[in-house]
């Protein structure tokens, strides 16, 4: 019987470092090895018939035990599939190796209205583009961490908001007078130093009533 396996199905490595993606196989007399890269809608062949393809040959080397990168970039994050078949036969096996290239978060950008109307919906956003794996976001009001559930802390029990740590979106619905304050957010991805945005003041103002 044939086996194709990797003892490291997930590899996390800081950007600009070398890395090896392992692929061990047995039961093939004349193995033909291919490596495929998948990331979202992108699929690329890294290795075909035991040879590194032209787009990778300057920085990837084929070994009998895997492929080795001289230096990885954030664009290399994705799933690599090692596919082994018998030359001229029908034996086949494959193994997937997930590569996560670690990049610390950059300073997040916030979109916070300087004023918003009490009783209305107010949307605050926080995002950063560099972090790999993607960052999770924490919001602060006047320097105090905002819990995911406002009812869980006395300081925020009068607020009505939904906070999504994955997207960084903070939605007040409805906005109340007590939501006035200075807001900032922090991005962290478990690698490098967490980064904090600028603080922006939001005023919760009464609805203008026409005379």
């Amino acid at each position: 019987s044939v086996t194709v396996h990797s003892s490291e199905p997930e590899v996390r490595i800081p950007e600009n470092n070398p890395v090896k993606l392992s692929c061990a196989y047995s039961g093939f007399s004349s193995p033909r090895v291919e490596w495929k890269f998948d990331q979202g809608d992108t699929t690329r062949l890294v290795c075909y018939n035991n040879k590194i393809t032209a787009s990778y040959e300057d920085r990837v080397t084929f070994l009998p035990t895997g492929i080795t990168f001289k230096s990885v970039t954030r664009e290399d994050t994705g799933t690599y599939t090692c596919m082994v078949s018998e030359e001229g036969g029908n034996s086949y096996g494959e193994v997937k190796v997930k590569l996560i290239v670690l990049v610390p978060p950059s300073k997040p950008t916030v979109n916070i209205p300087s004023s918003a109307t009490i009783g209305n919906r107010a949307v605050l956003t926080c995002s950063e583009q560099d972090g790999s794996p993607p960052s999770e976001y924490t919001w602060f009001k006047d320097g105090i961490v905002m819990p995911t559930n406002p009812k869980s802390t006395r300081a925020f029990s009068n607020s009505s908001y939904v906070l999504n740590p994955t997207t960084g979106e903070l939605v007040f619905d409805p906005l109340s007078a007590s939501d006035t304050g200075e807001y900032s957010c922090e991005a962290r991805n478990g690698y490098g130093t967490p980064m904090t945005s600028n603080a922006v003041r939001m005023e919760a103002v009464e609805r203008n009533v026409g005379v």
Epitope: H5, S7, P18, K20
Partner: antibody, heavy 116, light 106 residues
Framework: EVQLVQSGAEVKKPGATVKISCKVS????????MHWVQQAPGKGLEWMGY????????RYAEKFQGRVTITADTSTDTAYMELSSLRSEDTAVYYC?????????WGQGTLVTVSS | DIQMTQSPSSLSASVGDRVTITCQAS??????IAWYQQKPGKAPKLLIH???TLETGVPSRFSGSGSGTDYTFTISSLQPEDIATYYC????????FGQGTKVEIK
């Protein structure tokens, strides 16, 4: 014939650093990752980390992270394991082992004694 | 991380006895288990990989079986030269050894 030959026994004081070598022959050094395994007296085997000699990439077990450094010299087909800030608990036999998927060939072991 | 629980930690058996050692993984390891023999003052020696594949030159009295999380190593007829400590190694996801089983002759 595949062979992994390690350097001789070492006696070190607490706080010191030890560097052990593992010279290979009988195969292409850069084709296989080289691992290091610790065995304290009367105890079991514990994986420490490895190096890919082709590109110098390393991975370390959490327990040893920050104290262990594994390197390789492809000009001499030799792998090295350096352990710093030694303490009495580091008294052990250290093995290098070649990885195919599992560990198929091992060095003879190097005894490191940490004693004041 | 995957943990490997090996039992018994030691056993005493007579020459010719059937000896069984077990290793239980904390999760499915997909048959990626190897067994090693270590004699005093020597490096571990690979006997079996991928649950049951015997290394070249290893006597057929050694065998391995199992699947999922439960694996067994057997010496069908214990010989004096089999006195050693035996270790399992999972290599499905990184590398973890069992605690070892010391085999002695009664």
């Amino acid at each position: 014939e595949v062979q992994l030959v390690q350097s001789g026994a070492e006696v070190k004081k607490p706080g010191a650093t030890v560097k052990i070598s593992c010279k290979v022959s009988g195969y292409s050094f850069t084709d296989y990752s080289m691992h290091w395994v610790q065995q304290a007296p009367g105890k079991g085997l514990e994986w420490m980390g490895y190096i890919d000699p082709y590109n110098g990439g390393t991975r370390y077990a959490e327990k040893f992270q920050g104290r262990v450094t594994i390197t390789a010299d492809t000009s001499t087909d030799t792998a090295y394991m350096e352990l710093s800030s030694l303490r009495s608990e580091d008294t052990a036999v250290y093995y290098c082992a070649r990885q195919t998927d599992y560990f198929d060939y091992w060095g003879q072991g190097t005894l490191v004694t940490v004693s004041s | 991380d995957i943990q490997m629980t090996q039992s018994p930690s030691s056993l005493s058996a007579s020459v010719g006895d059937r000896v069984t050692i077990t290793c239980q993984a904390s999760q499915d390891i997909n048959n990626y288990i190897a067994w090693y023999q270590q004699k005093p003052g020597k490096a571990p020696k690979l006997l079996i990989h991928y649950t049951s594949t015997l290394e070249t030159g290893v006597p057929s009295r050694f065998s391995g079986s199992g699947s999922g999380t439960d694996y067994t190593f057997t010496i069908s007829s214990l010989q004096p030269e089999d006195i050693a400590t035996y270790y399992c190694l999972q290599y499905d996801n990184l590398w973890t050894f069992g605690q070892g089983t010391k085999v002695e002759i009664k």
